[in-house]
Every structure is written in structure tokens, then in C-alpha cells.
């Protein structure tokens, strides 16, 4: 059998086989050693017994989408049946004090590969045995600790495969310079050691995407905005836009990146090299935000211009275009190509509470001579829309340990002046966070307050 017979039905065209060579990967036309690495179809009864105590699940993830030319990293994590884990030696053991359906196990090992390898290796003097090989016959790499690696991962995409020896978690990075744009399929088959052979334990596949568009995401933040994810913001307060470029392999690290903004409010285009920008909308309404990101990225070099054609055909030159050097690329050429990314959002601008201030605090005199608690009035002003709710969070002087939170509806006139009355149990210094809210905004002010002992002579004061 060949690798493509074993690893999947997605057979790429001959064009892909010829043009999309991945560095360090091999053609899936190669032969697969079925004696060492048996192949089971989906639904084969042998899968049930491929792992002691249940089925192993393989989870394949990637940091897709990848900008063409960058590296994409795939990670496979094995999830063992309940109560099983891999130990420092690569053996699979039962977790202590963990009960599964079979109860507590007397044998600490699910698979004791250390013991197997010590008494089962008929090796030659080089430390290499005929079974320490990958499915295509290549020997396992002998880096330190390789004996503790008991899983064989075979990655397959674009008509090529990559083999890796590993533990319960492996990562593989692929350069996408030669990968066709669009969605592609990565398939992974995982085998475990089994004496002098291997047993399949899991198969998994995942779609990844290679794109020529820079993957761009914009986060938006505005002080007093109640819900930053609803794309509704407040008039007359700056919004901070922060551009996040998805570039996990740092492909664009040395690129100059330009950001071209259109905020949709007739303020024109704004061009910047900074990934953050502030913008204030001064009118209510719905606006279309557009961002274009431009980066000069490493890319393929254009073919050189064809040589000038002679006026008369010259027999000694041979047919035009037959020269194999004409379209080849010089290997150490360092070419740049402009890549673009786009982001568009519709944002709604509404009235909101712009500011809140405590302008006065008063100790409310109680009718009782020595009450156990103090009533404090906070006189508060605000700017912007009419608040509908007031919340006070009373904490310790560091403002970290909350003692009491009270929220209640509030009736405020157009002047936006209100008095909030709160109870303080006992004297001392308190941190008071006071927020005024409406449907779209939440404005905060804080103060430290010193509540005196209940001696009528001691005044209330702001501690800061």
C-alpha cells in the first residue's frame, strides 16, 4: 500500500503534487509498511481494543488562517480515557485516587513502555532495531529521550506526509509559501507502540486556510460604554480602535505596516503606521467603518522580463521559451510583495452618560442619639444622557475587597443632579465606587471616605 491509500481519500491533482512541495515532507506515493503499521478502516472492530480502558481522542488544532508565505502550526493533543495520564517517562499510568467504571486499579500502569523496550529490543550495535522506524521505513531520530516517545504521528496534506515521533502532544509547523490559497485539509493518524509493532489509536482531520489577505481584527474600546461587543458607542467620547493582525509565526515582524482608516462620518481618510487610533464621533447615527491594512511582506519574485525579440528569426536560438533558465527564480533573491487586509464594521453612535462627579458628601444626622450605622448622602452630577440606575460599591480603603454593592433605579431631572444615600456600618475609611448607568453607558467615579466615630463633633471628610 502507498501512503495515499492509507491516509485519506482527498487525492490532490498531479499539479499540486508537482508544485506544492512542502519543505521536509514526502510524497504520499511512497510505500507504507503495513506489517509494522496495520491499517484499519473506519468501523473495524479492532478499533475497540486499540487502547486499554476506552478510546483515545486526538484533538487537532491550528493557528489558521495563515498568510501565504508564513508558517502555520498544527498541534495534536491526545485525550486519554478517564483516570489515565502520561508520566515523565512516557508511560501511561492511572491517576492516583481516581475512580473510573472499573474502579481503582491495582496495577499503576496502563502501558509500561519502559519495561517493554528494555527486554524487547534486539538491536544491532548502532542502537537501531528494525522496528524503530516510521511507516515509510525511515529510522526514528535518536535525540535525547527518544525512547520516552511512544506515539507516532503521521500528518497528511496536499499529497504529502510528515512523520513525527512524540509524546501525548506534538506540534508541526509548515511553511505556506508553496501552498495553494484557500481551505485545505490536514489529516493526522496516530499510532502507539505495541511490542515490536504499532497499533492505530486515533485519526483526526481539520480544515486550515491559507490566504493572501492579511487576517485583521479590530477591537474597540470606549470609556463609559456599557457593552463593547454590541458595536454601539457614545457620542462625544473617543473610541480607541486597536488593530490585531493574526500573525502567530511573526511573518510580518520586519514589515512596515500602514493603516488607512475611513470612519464613515465625512472626516476623510486617516493614514497611520500605528496599530491604535482614537476617533470621536460628534453626531448620533450609524456609520460604516473601513480599514485597509497594507504590509510589504516577503514574497515570490516576479519572472524577469523576456529578452528582446530579434527582428528576424535566428535559427541558432531554438524555439522561444525553451530555455529552462528563463523562468527560474534566483534562490537568494529577497523579494517583497504588498499584502492587504480589510476590516469593515457598522457602528451605531448614541447619547450616553459622559461624566459623573461627586460634588458633596454629607453625614445625615439620625434621630437616635447613638445609632450603630452612619447614613451618608453623596450629591452627584453628571453630563450627557439621563441615567436610569445608580450603583455603589463600598470596599476597603485599597478598593479591592468589596463589602457591599447596591444598585437601584434612579429618577434624575435634565439638570442631572441627584443625591445617593448609603449606609456605612461603623467608622473607618471606605472606598466608594459610584456608577451611573443607562441602556448604553456606565460612568464611574470613585472616592475614599472617612466615616468618623459617632461623635457629633467629628466631621465627615473625603480621605483623599
Amino acid at each position: 500500500k502507498r501512503f495515499h491509500d492509507v491516509l485519506g481519500n482527498e487525492r490532490p491533482s498531479a499539479y499540486m503534487r508537482e508544485h506544492n512541495q512542502l519543505n521536509g515532507w514526502s510524497s504520499d506515493e511512497n510505500d507504507w509498511n503495513e506489517k509494522l503499521y496495520p491499517v484499519w478502516k473506519r468501523g473495524d472492530m479492532r478499533w475497540k481494543n486499540s487502547w486499554k480502558g476506552g478510546r483515545v481522542q486526538a484533538v487537532l488544532t491550528s493557528d489558521s488562517p495563515a498568510l501565504v508565505g508564513s508558517n502555520i502550526t498544527f498541534a495534536v493533543n491526545l485525550i486519554f480515557p478517564r483516570c489515565q495520564k502520561e508520566d515523565a517517562n512516557g508511560n501511561i499510568v492511572y491517576e492516583k485516587n481516581c475512580r473510573n467504571e472499573a474502579g481503582l486499579s491495582a496495577d499503576p500502569y496502563v502501558y509500561n513502555w519502559t519495561a517493554w523496550s528494555e527486554d524487547s529490543d534486539g538491536e544491532n550495535g548502532t542502537g537501531q532495531s528494525h522496528h524503530n522506524v516510521f511507516p515509510d521505513g525511515k529510522p526514528f531520530p535518536h535525540h535525547p529521550g527518544w525512547r520516552r516517545w511512544n506515539f507516532i504521528y503521521v500528518f497528511h496534506t496536499l499529497g504529502q506526509y510528515f512523520q513525527k515521533l512524540g509524546r501525548c502532544s506534538v506540534r508541526v509547523s509548515v511553511n505556506t509559501a508553496n501552498v495553494t490559497l484557500g481551505p485545505q485539509l490536514m489529516e493526522v493518524t496516530v499510532y502507539r507502540r505495541h511490542g515490536r509493532a504499532y497499533v492505530p489509536i486515533a485519526q483526526v482531520k481539520d480544515v486550515y486556510v491559507v490566504t493572501d489577505q492579511i487576517p485583521v481584527f479590530v477591537t474597540m474600546f470606549q470609556k463609559n460604554d456599557r457593552n463593547s461587543s454590541d458595536e454601539t458607542f457614545l457620542k462625544d467620547l473617543p473610541i480607541m480602535f486597536d488593530v490585531l493582525i493574526h500573525d502567530p509565526s511573526h511573518f510580518l515582524n520586519y514589515s512596515t505596516i500602514n493603516y488607512k482608516w475611513s470612519f464613515g462620518d465625512n472626516t476623510g481618510l486617516f493614514v497611520s503606521t500605528n496599530h491604535t487610533v482614537n476617533h470621536t464621533y460628534v453626531l448620533n447615527g450609524t456609520f460604516s467603518l473601513n480599514l485597509t491594512v497594507k504590509a510589504a511582506a516577503p514574497g515570490p519574485c516576479p519572472p524577469p522580463p523576456p529578452p528582446p525579440r530579434p527582428s528576424k528569426p535566428t535559427p541558432s536560438l531554438g524555439p522561444a521559451g525553451d530555455n529552462p533558465l528563463e523562468l527560474s527564480r534566483i534562490p537568494d533573491e529577497n523579494c517583497q510583495i504588498n499584502r492587504y487586509g480589510h476590516f469593515q464594521a457598522t457602528i451605531t453612535i448614541v447619547e450616553g452618560i459622559l461624566e459623573v462627579n461627586i460634588i458633596q458628601m454629607t453625614d445625615v444626622l439620625m434621630p437616635v442619639p447613638w445609632p450603630e450605622s452612619s447614613l451618608i448622602d453623596f450629591v452627584v452630577t453628571c453630563q450627557g444622557s439621563i441615567p436610569t440606575e445608580v450603583c455603589t460599591i463600598i470596599s476597603d480603603p485599597t478598593c479591592e475587597i468589596t463589602q457591599n454593592t447596591v444598585c437601584s433605579p434612579v429618577d434624575v431631572d435634565e439638570m442631572c443632579l441627584l443625591t445617593v444615600r448609603r449606609t456605612f456600618n461603623g467608622s473607618g475609611t471606605y472606598c466608594v465606587n459610584l456608577t451611573l448607568g443607562d441602556d448604553t453607558s456606565l460612568a464611574l467615579t470613585s472616592t475614599l471616605i472617612s466615616v468618623p466615630d459617632r461623635d457629633p463633633a467629628s466631621p465627615l471628610r473625603m480621605a483623599n
Epitope: V364, S373, I386, T388, E389, T392, N404, V406, C407, S408, P409, V410, D411, D413, E414, T419, R421, R422, T423, D438, D439, T440
Partner: antibody, heavy 116, light 111 residues
Framework: EVQLLESGGGLVQPGGSLRLSCAAS????????MSWVRQAPGKGLEWVSS????????YYADSVKGRFTISRDNSKNTLYLQMNSLRAEDTAVYYC?????????WGQGTLVTVSS | QSVLTQPPSASGTPGQRVTISCSGS????????VSWYQQLPGTAPKLLIY???QRPSGVPDRFSGSKSGTSASLAISGLRSEDEADYYC???????????FGGGTKLTVLG
């Protein structure tokens, strides 16, 4: 002069629906939160629901949650209470009141009777 | 069972001073303003006291409100026959997210 005038009350069978209205005048309706309070015959006052000036925030008593819906039309200076799945215990005079942290003006009320 | 507790009845003779109590908890009276409402027989309620002790314009200064901890009280001095009515205390409850009333106190003016 602030005036609140309720309408829409009447006799309805259990499980039925009714929509109360409250026409407001004498103040800038869109600047104020509004509320509904009810009083069963011979009993005390029970708060039913409140709505913010813009209509974006709404509160309901547990006894009516999921059955009653408060709403307002600021262009018409009108407050509404849509009452569905009515029960015998919803029988009461329903008052419309201005504000929600305190009720500074009240209407004269409209009687809702739920009976088969 | 009301969240705020009031005595069901109170009485006094004309000219006397009468106090009606209202007790609650830190989530209502303790940290929110208390209001008092007067309901004359056969009429809609009317706001008498707001923000614990403030009187709306038109309410005589014979009516006064006060609060201490989780209790509030309404005092009526110089009692008159026209004060005969039901009196309710009310406050927002921040735990219940609801406005709560006391069960009401029926004030009778004797004589």
C-alpha cells in the same frame, strides 16, 4: 399640571389578555421613568412593573414576570401594560405612576377583573 | 407577607402626634430611599414623603419622615380628622430588583 389617565380595564376570563394604557400630560414624558402599581380589593399596594425614560430598562415583580410586558411610546406620551395569561389573583385596580425610585404622581386607576 | 413591615393600625385623637413605623433590611430601607404614601378612602395614593424625609410641595409640615438603619418612621403631629387614611411605606429592594411596599397602616382619628 401633571395628569395620568389609565384606560383598558374590564372583565376578562382566566387565561385571557388585556392591554392597559396610561396617557400622560403636563410634563416631558420622555424624561421620566414610569411604573404600574396595583391594589387588589381591600388589600395593600403591590408594585407591578417599571420602565426607564427611553424604554431600554424594564423591571417586573416576580408575580407577573413572563406574563406582563411594560412598554411606552414617547411620541404619544403613553405607557402600556400588556397582560397575558391572566389569573384570578390579578384582579385589582391598576394605577399608572410617574418615576420608579418613588412614585410622585398617580393616576386614578382602572379596574381589571379576572373571573369566569 | 410584605417585605416591609408596618403595624396594621394606628389611632390618635385630634391634635395628637402619631408615629407609624416601617421596618425592612439593608437591601431596601438600609441602602435606598424610603417614601411614604397616603391613600384617602376611595382615592388613588398620594406621595407624602420621599427620600426618607423630604416633603413634596403642598404636603403640610405636620408630616415628617425619618430613618435609622433598616427602619423608617412617619410622624404626624397635630392630628386632624382628614388625616384618617391608609399609609404605606415603600422602597426599592436592591436584592429583589423590585419596589416593595409595607402592608399599610390604617390610621383612625378618634373622637
Amino acid at each position: 399640571e401633571v395628569q395620568l389617565l389609565e384606560s383598558g380595564g374590564g372583565l376578562v376570563q382566566p387565561g385571557g389578555s388585556l392591554r392597559l394604557s396610561c396617557a400622560a400630560s403636563g410634563f416631558t414624558f420622555s424624561n421620566y421613568a414610569m411604573s404600574w402599581v396595583r391594589q387588589a380589593p381591600g388589600k395593600g399596594l403591590e408594585w407591578v412593573s417599571s420602565i426607564s425614560h427611553s424604554g431600554g430598562s424594564k423591571y417586573y415583580a416576580d408575580s407577573v414576570k413572563g406574563r406582563f410586558t411594560i412598554s411606552r411610546d414617547n411620541s404619544k406620551n403613553t405607557l402600556y401594560l400588556q397582560m397575558n395569561s391572566l389569573r384570578a389573583e390579578d384582579t385589582a385596580v391598576y394605577y399608572c405612576a410617574r418615576k420608579w425610585s418613588t412614585f410622585d404622581y398617580w393616576g386614578q386607576g382602572t379596574l381589571v377583573t379576572v373571573s369566569s | 407577607q410584605s417585605v416591609l413591615t408596618q403595624p396594621p393600625s394606628a389611632s390618635g385623637t385630634p391634635g395628637q402626634r402619631v408615629t407609624i413605623s416601617c421596618s425592612g433590611s439593608s437591601s431596601n430601607i438600609g441602602n435606598n430611599y424610603v417614601s411614604w404614601y397616603q391613600q384617602l378612602p376611595g382615592t388613588a395614593p398620594k406621595l407624602l414623603i420621599y427620600a426618607d424625609s423630604q416633603r413634596p410641595s403642598g404636603v403640610p409640615d405636620r408630616f415628617s419622615g425619618s430613618k435609622s438603619g433598616t427602619s423608617a418612621s412617619l410622624a404626624i403631629s397635630g392630628l386632624r380628622s382628614e388625616d384618617e387614611a391608609d399609609y404605606y411605606c415603600g422602597a426599592w429592594d436592591s436584592s429583589l430588583n423590585a419596589y416593595v411596599f409595607g402592608g399599610g397602616t390604617k390610621l383612625t382619628v378618634l373622637g
